[in-house]
Structure formats: C-alpha cells, structure tokens
C-alpha cells in the first residue's frame, strides 16, 4: 500500500508536518504531541510581556 | 491490504514479564505510528500507548497506568513492532490488540490473550 | 485523564429503526486552531476486534457505509445509525485523542429485537 501525502498544501500553506494527522506539531518544541497539549498563551498581565502564543502546523487530509 | 497480528500472549504468573509481538504487513512500517491497546474481558478498552514512525524519532507515549512497567519498541527491519510487559499483575489480564495509528486507531488486529494467575 | 461517559449502556432495537447513542467528555476535545474534535468511535462486533467508524467526530472512514453518522462539538457527541441493519449488533466506543492518555468510553451495546 503506498502512503499518502500527509498533509496537503496549498499556495500559502504551511509545509507539511511530519505528524500523522491524529497529532499536532508543536513548533516551540519541534516534535508531533496531542493537539491538546497545545495551548494559546495565557492573557498577560497589564505591562507585562510574554513571548509568543504557542502554536501548531496541523495536517488536513 | 493492512494486516495485523499479534502474538505472544498466554499464561504468566504474577510479577513475571511477557512479551507480545505485532507483525505487520501491507504497509510501510516505519512510516506509521503504532499503538497497543488492550480490553479486559467483558470490559472496555484501555489505550496503553504508542510508537511514533522514524519521522519523528521512533519516541513514544505511554498511559500513565502503565508507564514504567510497559515498553513499547519496533523491529522495523523484521515489520515487528512489541509490547514489553514487566512485573504483572492480575488486573493486566486482558486481551491485547496492536492498531495503526493514523486519523484515529484506524486498523486493528485481532488481538492476543494475556492471563495473569498463580 | 479525560472521562468519557457513554449511554445509554445498552439498547435493544428493532432492524430498521434509528438510534442515537451519546458520548460525553469530562473537557472540549475541541482544538480551536483547527476546528477539529478529537472524538473517534468504534465499533467491536461479538468475538472481533474494534473497527473505526468515525474520527474527527463527524468523518466517516473510507467504507463505513453512510447510515453510521458522528456529529457534536466541544464535550457532547452522537453516534447515529438512520436505520439499522442486524449486522449492526455490536458494542459502539467513543474515544478521545486530544490529550494523553488516550481514553475509551465504556460502550454502548447495540442489541436487535
């Protein structure tokens, strides 16, 4: 059986990830995890700075 | 066509180790995650974790439940992947099922019976 | 973990009629990136092992035939059957794979009258 693309791109897609589509890519880490597991930042504090919401490339079939 | 077949279960007394193998055919083993799953007779199911493809490193994710006591590991040049069950107990008695996992547990096989008993 | 509770526990019905069987998680499986609710169910005929019938709660896998139907959001999911076959005899699992551990209900037992 030959496998399928895993994700399919288009014009201004991200590129595909290499996680299976039950999974997200965590790009703070670099590694596939539960989508779950990826969580939007918290809203800061007033003042306060914080980096960057961690995000997620996630396949579609 | 995927196929899965477990084997390797049987009989094992209390705090003993077994080894259950999943053979593989009809796809290309490295390039999917594999899953064990298992079902307690007359019970639901409970997912005990898996192996992820050589994409991503061959890591691994285990239930809590069994973390420490189960190692999930591949033989990829044999399209064998195992479930390496140390120090078990009677609750662990169960049919065990191999799955490919892809959009969900998408292929399954047939299973093998594991009974922990003096 | 996420709890997922399922019911009703069993249900006998005749060949022809609908049935809805529900599942509910104890958090959204909802990934707001995506849209996506990572709900599967599965279906174990007697002596077989477990088939998947639908991921990402409302897709149906290629060959599921069309009267087996997933839908919900966030907590709450319905499994639908529009007409049943007696072939349809089997015990239908929910399962979440948003977060690890990945975890099943305990089953809905579909018995025909």
């Known amino acids: 059986m030959r496998r399928g693309p895993r994700s399919l791109r288009g014009r201004d897609a991200p590129a595909p990830t290499p996680c299976v589509p039950a999974e997200c890519f965590d790009l703070l880490v670099r590694h596939c995890v539960a989508c779950g597991l990826l969580r939007t930042a918290r809203p800061k504090p007033a003042g306060a700075s914080s980096p960057a919401p961690r995000t997620a490339l996630q396949p579609q079939e | 066509e995927v196929k899965l077949v477990e084997s390797g279960g049987g009989l094992v007394q209390p705090g003993g180790s077994l080894r259950l193998s999943c053979a593989i055919s009809?796809?290309?083993?490295?390039?999917?995650?594999m899953s064990w799953v298992r079902q307690p007779p007359g019970k639901a199911l409970e997912w005990l974790g898996f192996?992820?493809?050589?994409?991503?490193?061959?890591?691994?994710e285990y239930n809590p439940s069994v973390k420490g006591r189960f190692t999930i590991s591949r033989d990829n040049s044999q399209s064998i992947f195992y479930l390496q069950m140390n120090t078990l107990r009677a609750e662990d008695s169960a049919t065990y099922y191999c799955?490919?996992?892809?959009?969900?547990?998408?292929?399954w096989g047939q299973g093998t019976t594991v009974t922990v008993s003096a | 973990d996420i709890v997922m509770s399922q019911s009703p526990s069993s249900l006998a019905v005749s060949v022809g009629e609908k049935v809805t069987m529900s599942c509910k998680s104890s958090?959204?499986?909802?990934?707001?990136?995506?849209?996506?609710?990572?709900l599967a169910w599965y279906q174990q005929k007697p002596g077989q092992s477990p088939k998947l019938l639908i991921y990402?709660?409302?897709t149906r896998e290629s060959g599921v035939p069309d009267r087996f139907t997933g839908s919900g959001s966030g907590t709450d999911f319905t499994l639908t059957i529009s007409s049943v076959k007696a072939e349809d005899l089997a015990v239908y699992y929910c399962?979440?794979?948003?977060?690890?551990?990945?975890?099943f209900g305990g089953g809905t037992k579909l018995e025909i009258k």
């Open positions: 799955a490919q996992v892809r959009r969900a547990l998408d292929y």
């Open positions: 009809g796809f290309t083993v490295t390039a999917y995650y």
């Open positions: 192996i992820r493809d050589k994409a991503n490193g061959y890591t691994t």
């Open positions: 958090q959204s499986l909802l990934y707001s990136s995506n849209q996506n609710n990572y």
């Open positions: 990402w709660a409302s």
């Open positions: 399962q979440q794979y948003y977060t690890y551990p990945y975890t």
